[in-house]
Amino acid sequence: EEELQVIQPEKSVSVAAGDSATLNCTVSSLIPVGPIQWFRGAGPGRELIYNLKEGHFPRVTAVSDPTKRNNMDFSIRISNITPADAGTYYCVKFRKGSPDVELKSGAGTELSVRAKPSAPVVSGPAVRATAEHTVSFTCESHGFSPRDITLKWFKNGNELSDVQTNVDPAGKSVSYSIRSTARVLLTRRDVHSQVICEVAHVTLQGDPLRGTANLSEAIRVPPFLEVTQQSMRADNQVNVTCQVTKFYPQRLQLTWLENGNVSRTEMASALPENKDGTYNWTSWLLVNVSAHRDDVKLTCQVEHDGQPAVNKSFSVKVSAHPKEQGSNTAAENTGTNERNIYGGSG
């Protein structure tokens, strides 16, 4: 008699998550009498997927009526496929007995599940970094299958090259994760910049997923400080200006010191934004020269975003120099960020 054959025609079947998978199996002979069972995997740890005779398999149905006389088609349909269903499925013929004896197995059908990657999540550095420093951004996406995936990084539309990407696990799995790190050199112009992580996968039909991060959350642009004397007024008041420019974020505290003593402290708030996203702030201090016998050392002290304070100092000379009265040109820069302003005493 002809030897019984169990035929699984497809070596592999690929199905999108959520869809149904049909696993085909036919036998070449009605004899010997005995059931067909479907298993995932082989050996003692294999998992029973479908047994027509007994058991409850809510997601599995027979494609054709297995109770029909002369039925030789034992194909099954598994509904609502998830990545956890991936594996090799075997159609196995048993000879009727007590217990039934395994007689012949099909060659197996490998079921792979196409699953979309999750929306990429981009995270930046935990602390801000100043311009001209390099910071790392990470992008993660999970749960996709098959393993082949493309991830690209962009900064303001330009692709980044300093990128390291890993897909895990290395071996075969029901689903995969991708993690990529991009190193970005910050510039003072990056407050409005954005990095984009773009993930392309066969399940996305050419419409990649994107995750974004704003460099405004990663960057600190330290201020420029300039202290100038605006004028010498007739009432012997010197108007000194501290200009704090091109800083980000807005969090800033300015303190005026007269001869080392705090004169006034101000907090920046509700400042207008420059085109590049940075801020400017100007603070004035009126110094009554006639109230001072000795030279006055003025210091504009700026503490930006919790960083160490930056100082700019001036010396207002309280001495009789009538011809220089009202002058704002006689300032000379010392090596210690100080300026000497010579004010006449009238």
Partner: antibody, heavy 122, light 112 residues
Framework: QVQLQESGPGLVRPSETLSLTCTVS????????WSWIRQPPGKGLEWMGF???????FYNPSLKSRVTISLDMSMNQFSLKMTSVTAADTAVYYC????????????????WGQGTTVTVSS | DIVMTQSPLSLPVTPGEPASISCKSS???????????LDWYLQRPGQSPQLLIY???NRASGVPDRFSGSGSGTDFTLKISRVEAEDVGVYYC?????????FGGGTKVEIK
Amino acid sequence: QVQLQESGPGLVRPSETLSLTCTVSGGSIRNYYWSWIRQPPGKGLEWMGFIYDNGRTFYNPSLKSRVTISLDMSMNQFSLKMTSVTAADTAVYYCARVRAYSGIGLDGTDVWGQGTTVTVSS
Amino acid sequence: DIVMTQSPLSLPVTPGEPASISCKSSQSLLYSNAYNYLDWYLQRPGQSPQLLIYLGSNRASGVPDRFSGSGSGTDFTLKISRVEAEDVGVYYCMQALQTPLTFGGGTKVEIK
């Protein structure tokens, strides 16, 4: 080609727990059984148990109450934990891959790690 | 548990000569699918075991054809047609019919 690498402490105190990890490189965990086998000094081989890719475990009854084998597919690793060790558990511990085919079953432990020596001593 | 018994315990051999190792199981390793669930392994000195023969008579990949496995049911034999120096080590049989998998006590093959 597939390679297996055992890792874990070489010395364990009596009554403590022995923990070993086997890292699978160059291949997949799927469709195989993953074994732990040990060999006491100057003696023969003893099968401790194995785990299938679906997480199903099989243990040697002589050790069952003390042994746990687990699988981490994301790391391509499987692990052995054995509680309440004694000097009799001093051995070279091998991790190994067992092939399996439907209609055949187990057909050969075809890949072995190089083995790691574990000494149980105070 | 299935008990595996190997003989001889030690086998001195002459290079170029044949050698034979016996393995007996306490119950039949022949399953209804006509396969004998017996494997042979060689453990060279200081090395891990390596698979030589699986399912009674199938040579593993890369194993020289001077190695052959035979037998059925409870009696099995590993033959080396012409022993070479690299064949020294301890040979183990193992049953894979049911868990727990069990090994024979080993046969030490050494050059005379």
